[in-house]
């Protein structure tokens, strides 16, 4: 029935479907949104709970050490290489994450100050 509705409401030949988003918690029944041109559809779907239990996070990465601080942006970066993915998770092979350079320095300074006050 769901598929018929999609067909009737559309002349589209190929729909692009987003991930299944559970209605509550991290598994079970939920919805998946599809787009085709300007049209959108929402269909029921299910994230199997046993898979979530077995795999935990969808994408697990092995990270390099943090790079040097980039003075122009005030951030440092590191790269992660895919270590393990949930079977149906479309994970990037590599990812790059950044964080402010100052956050660690500030927290260290605060900690030192705190210790000094003690």
């Amino acid at each position: 029935k769901k598929k018929e509705k999609v067909k009737k409401g559309s002349e589209c030949s190929e729909w692009t479907w987003g991930p299944c988003t559970p209605s509550s918690k991290d598994c079970g029944m939920g919805f998946r949104e599809g787009t085709c041109g300007a049209q959108t559809q929402r269909v029921h779907c299910k994230v199997p709970c046993n898979w979530k239990k077995e795999f935990g996070a969808d994408c697990k990465y092995k990270f390099e050490s943090w790079g040097a601080c980039d003075g122009s942006t005030g951030t440092k970066a590191r790269q992660g290489t895919l270590k393990k993915a949930r079977y149906n998770a479309q994970c990037q092979e590599t990812i790059r994450v950044t964080k402010p350079c100052t956050s660690k320095t500030k927290s260290k300074t605060k900690a030192k100050k705190g210790k000094g006050k003690d």
């Epitope: 190929e14 729909w15 692009t16 479907w17 299944c20 998946r32 029921h44 779907c45 299910k46 199997p48 046993n50 898979w51 077995e54 290489t81 895919l82 270590k83 393990k84 993915a85 079977y87 149906n88 998770a89 479309q90 994970c91 990037q92 092979e93």
Partner: antibody
Amino acid sequence: QVQLVQSGAEVKKPGASVKVSCKASGQSFSSYWMNWVRQAPGQGLEWIGMIHPSDSETILNQKFKDKATLTVDISTSTAYMELSSLRSEDTAVYYCSSWSAKRGDFWGQGTLVTVSS
Amino acid sequence: EIVLTQSPATLSLSPGERANLSCRASESISNNLHWYQQKPHQAPRLLIKYASQSISGIPARFSGSGPGTDFNLTISSVEPEDFAVYYCQQSNSWPLTFGGGTKLEIK
């Protein structure tokens, strides 16, 4: 691009065991699920199980729990499937395939295992 | 386990015709359905993943639809090299299962 090269054809007697290998080259072997699938002569495809090289997590089709043992050797980028207590109905072509939901999969060329007395 | 039923078992077409292959799941499998082509003495080749996602290197004449329980593989205009056996496979739950196959033969 991943290339999977499987070991050669085997002829075994009933009750014997056989170990099929699947050597990967190209992209990271350890990041992707390795599936094992069999195809009996003139028949369809049947999933045996899969193993993840990063931690050797294995998920077997219950039908093969007493038949197949899956292992990996990260140092040589090789996956293995051992089949025990062979019977004539285990005669089939056995395939390995490396799966990524993002890019798809790559298959080995297949290994024919013939069980005959 | 999830049972996948493919139809028709055999499809006889001439080159240039449109092919519609069906795969029905025994329960809803979202979009976790993949299509493979297999030629004699060759390993299967992935054509479409997750119901409708194209695969690099696969001709644009192959397309898929879903999700839910009813899935279709369409070959817009069959080429001589397309005559083969086509299998659907689900990855929604263990064990992974395949359909029985549809043989596309020359009419």
